[in-house]
């Protein structure tokens, strides 16, 4: 059982554990999300992503979650259960990112560019909100990310 993001294979990640970690904090996160009209991982970000694009897109999205979302939220929360859940998610995201090596070849430029444009839509939506609201919404949308990642899961 592994993820196949196009040519990028990821082993050793158990999706069940990601879901368990997310569900442990889901109600808290989504209850704190007051901006229900906006969505960060909108349709245009995740819809019809090709296998070739998926490696670039998941790499940039997970890196953003690690460097911006988890890092900043970790400094704002004190509840042990919440910290434990975020640690589980972050550790697994690190494991995924460490195995992703998107090709930097010139012939992949258009695919890389397409994935980057999708990521920019997400980042723009994130930056339009104030920091606290953006972090809360991003964490509350981890289920959208996990659901999309299932498309690249292999039994």
């Amino acid at each position: 059982q592994e993820f196949h993001f196009g040519p990028c294979q990821v082993k050793g990640v158990v999706p069940q554990k990601l879901w368990e970690a997310f569900w442990a904090v889901k109600d808290t996160m989504q209850a704190q999300d007051n901006i229900t009209s906006a969505r960060l991982l909108q349709q245009e970000v995740l819809q019809n992503v090709s296998d070739a694009e998926s490696c670039y897109l998941v790499h940039t999205l997970l890196e953003f979650y690690l460097k911006t979302v988890f890092k900043n939220y970790h400094n704002r929360t004190v509840e042990v259960r919440t910290l434990k859940s975020f640690s589980t998610l972050a550790n697994n995201f690190v494991l995924i990112v460490s195995q992703l090596q998107p090709s930097q070849e010139n012939e992949m430029f258009s695919i890389r560019d397409s994935a980057h444009r999708r990521f920019l839509l997400f980042r723009r939506a994130f930056k339009q909100l104030d920091v606290e609201a953006a972090l809360t919404k991003a964490l509350g949308e981890v289920d959208i990310l996990l659901t999309w990642m299932q498309k690249f899961y292999k039994l």
């Epitope: 069940q16 368990e20 299932q150 899961y153």
Partner: antibody, heavy 119, light 106 residues
Framework: QLQLVESGGALVQPGGSLRLSCAAS????????MSWVRQAPGKGLEWVSH????????FYAESMKGRATISRDNAKNTLYLQMNSLKSEDTAVYYC????????????WGQGTQVTVSS | SYELTQSPSVSVALKQTAKITCGGD??????AQWYQQKPGQAPVLVIY???RRPSGIPERFSGSNSGNTATLTISGAQAEDEADYYC?????????FGGGTHLTVL
């Protein structure tokens, strides 16, 4: 050999209760979320309930909220569904299913157990 | 709550191609599964993650998912493919099944 064996189905009167069991073998039970899915006579599949591998997270279909409780005993490799205040529309074959992703990827199903609610 | 729409029945001539569709709002952003069920038997997973085939499922079964429609395609339908087919996705902490499509192989 992976196996899911349901039991506990019976004929029960409206308003009655029933506890279904699903004995699992051939895989590391607590690593996987599990679900109950039912099928009324001549009808389609209807998801009933879901429980995470650690048992901490549970979800229910609207039709069963407040009347059903899903649980698991990971030491016994067994999944349960406690159903109360049963109605005639709960008559169905109840299947347990192993979730291979944690959010509805049912690669393995039991053979089902018949629940009939009638006076 | 999320809904999936399937046409109740589809007919196909033996060895021809059958297409069974499943409609849902923005289903393309979700992972779609397809199950085959024969009378008196438990469902069997035939397609998962939109287009992947579990081991043991014949190559004639394929799937796609885009926009508001997921599609199960059976290329060169065989008599043993006559069954009910259900699409399924996960949405907001719930599994959702389509109403099912009965495939008749003529």
């Amino acid at each position: 050999q992976l196996q899911l064996v349901e039991s506990g189905g019976a004929l029960v009167q409206p308003g009655g209760s029933l506890r279904l069991s699903c004995a699992a073998s051939g895989f590391t039970f607590d690593d996987y979320a599990m679900s109950w899915v039912r099928q009324a006579p001549g009808k389609g599949l209807e998801w009933v309930s879901h429980i995470s591998g650690n048992g901490f997270s549970t979800f229910y279909a609207e039709s069963m909220k407040g009347r059903a409780t899903i649980s698991r005993d990971n030491a016994k490799n067994t999944l349960y569904l406690q159903m109360n205040s049963l109605k005639s529309e709960d008559t169905a074959v109840y299947y347990c299913a192993k979730d291979d992703y944690g959010s509805g990827l049912y690669a393995y199903w039991g053979q089902g157990t018949q629940v009939t609610v009638s006076s | 709550s999320y809904e999936l729409t399937q046409s109740p029945s589809v007919s196909v001539a033996l060895k021809q191609t059958a297409k069974i569709t499943c409609g849902g709002d923005n289903i393309g952003s979700k992972s779609a599964q397809w199950y085959q069920q024969k009378p008196g038997q438990a469902p069997v997973l035939v397609i998962y993650a939109d287009s992947r085939r579990p081991s043991g499922i014949p190559e004639r079964f394929s799937g796609s998912n885009s926009g508001n429609t997921a599609t199960l395609t059976i290329s060169g339908a065989q008599a043993e493919d006559e069954a009910d087919y259900y699409c399924q996705v996960w949405d907001s902490s719930a599994a959702v099944f389509g109403g099912g499509t009965h495939l008749t192989v003529l």
